[in-house]
Amino acid sequence: FERTRSLQDPCSNCPAGTFCDNNRNQICSPCPPNSFSSAGGQRTCDICRQCKGVFRTRKECSSTSNAECDCTPGFHCLGAGCSMCEQDCKQGQELTKKGCKDCCFGTFNDQKRGICRPWTNCSLDGKSVLVNGTKERDVVCGPSPADLSPGASSVTPPAPAREPGHSPQ
């Protein structure tokens, strides 16, 4: 199949990093500067992504692969491929329209991004609070008093945290 295809379409012989140049009798020409082709047989090369301003270059563009951006220090990426940058806050805070604000009592955030989430309600599982929660950490639930018999497990890990939402700029 490959041989048949190459007989029919000379462009299929052009490797990644080149394009099939119609202006030059379908010769394989190297991708021009600031462009790339990640697969063979391309009739054009794609423009490289540019990382400027709040974005910084994580991976340089090459003739065969696109540039990759991430955010400058103090920011984190939002969206697939880092399409936007959002300011970091400290643990124990969340980003609001008025900037980074401490988590309200009864909530916590153990990351530099995302929203403050309510402490786990141990009593819903019939357990008691073993370690109090803080702005930065969830409570740790322990066994209920009735479970405190020899050989009983002493600590239950907290419920898994929900995926943090995207908080306002």
């Epitope: 794609d46 992504r49 301003g53 709040v54 969206g79 399409s83 900037g99 700029q169």
Partner: antibody
Framework: QVQLQESGPGLVKPSETLSLTCTVS????????VHWIRQPPGKGLEWIGA???????DYNAAFISRVTISVDTSKNQFSLKLSSVTAADTAVYYC?????????WGQGTLVTVSS | EIVLTQSPGTLSLSPGERATLSCKAS??????VSWYQQKPGQAPRLLIY???NRYTGIPDRFSGSGSGTDFTLTISRLEPEDFAVYYC?????????FGQGTRLEIK
């Protein structure tokens, strides 16, 4: 709260220099850059250029010979200067914070170029 | 520069209907397309970033899709406040560019 506000003369004579300022609050000028974007009456949006948090600039090639964007951190202001203006430069001029997708804009200021 | 072409130029629909707006790029821009809503006398407002991510506070009737050169903004059920001009913009390569806009008007 993040706020940007453009200001400057609403009327500029042809061949003169248009000067606008973008006064910001709610964020640090050393952390964020700003873009300038304009919109002629009844038309679409056109990117003029940007100044980054480190002070370097990028301009649209269509304006590069007559545009200057600068920052005055002491006044919390960015500025745009566009020289040798013509009637075609009549537009609403916006500044927008650099976050990768223009989430925060000023309200815009209309500049009319006329003698 | 990358040219973004929006269609249709004007879309006439009634509240409750579904709106589909198109944006085509002259080059591959990955998923680095944003959508903005603009009402008369106001600045544009970010709706969608990264082709499909709803920005904070944007109702879930707004959704974006696409990658490469073809992008779509869908408003699933039009509310009276949705009638406005919509722009797509690319943040992939400089100079940053915008489409010419689609006017969404009440039928």
């Amino acid at each position: 709260q993040v706020q940007l506000q453009e200001s400057g003369p609403g009327l500029v004579k042809p061949s003169e220099t248009l000067s606008l300022t973008c006064t910001v609050s709610g964020f640090s000028l050393t952390t964020y850059g700003v873009h300038w974007i304009r919109q002629p009456p009844g038309k679409g949006l056109e990117w003029i250029g940007a100044i980054w948090s480190g002070g370097s600039t990028d301009y649209n090639a269509a304006f590069i010979s007559r545009v200057t964007i600068s920052v005055d951190t002491s006044k919390n202001q960015f500025s745009l200067k566009l020289s040798s203006v013509t009637a075609a430069d009549t537009a609403v001029y916006y500044c927008a914070r650099d976050d990768g997708s223009f989430a925060n804009w000023g309200q815009g200021t209309l500049v009319t170029v006329s003698s | 520069e990358i040219v973004l072409t929006q269609s249709p130029g004007t879309l006439s629909l009634s509240p409750g209907e579904r709106a589909t707006l198109s944006c085509k790029a002259s080059e591959n821009v990955g998923t680095y397309v944003s959508w903005y809503q603009q009402k008369p006398g106001q600045a544009p407002r970010l709706l969608i970033y990264g082709a499909s991510n709803r920005y904070t506070g944007i109702p879930d009737r707004f959704s974006g899709s696409g990658s490469g050169t073809d992008f779509t903004l869908t408003i699933s059920r039009l509310e009276p406040e949705d009638f406005a001009v919509y722009y797509c913009g690319q943040t992939y390569s400089y100079p940053l560019t915008f489409g010419q806009g689609t006017r969404l008007e009440i039928k």
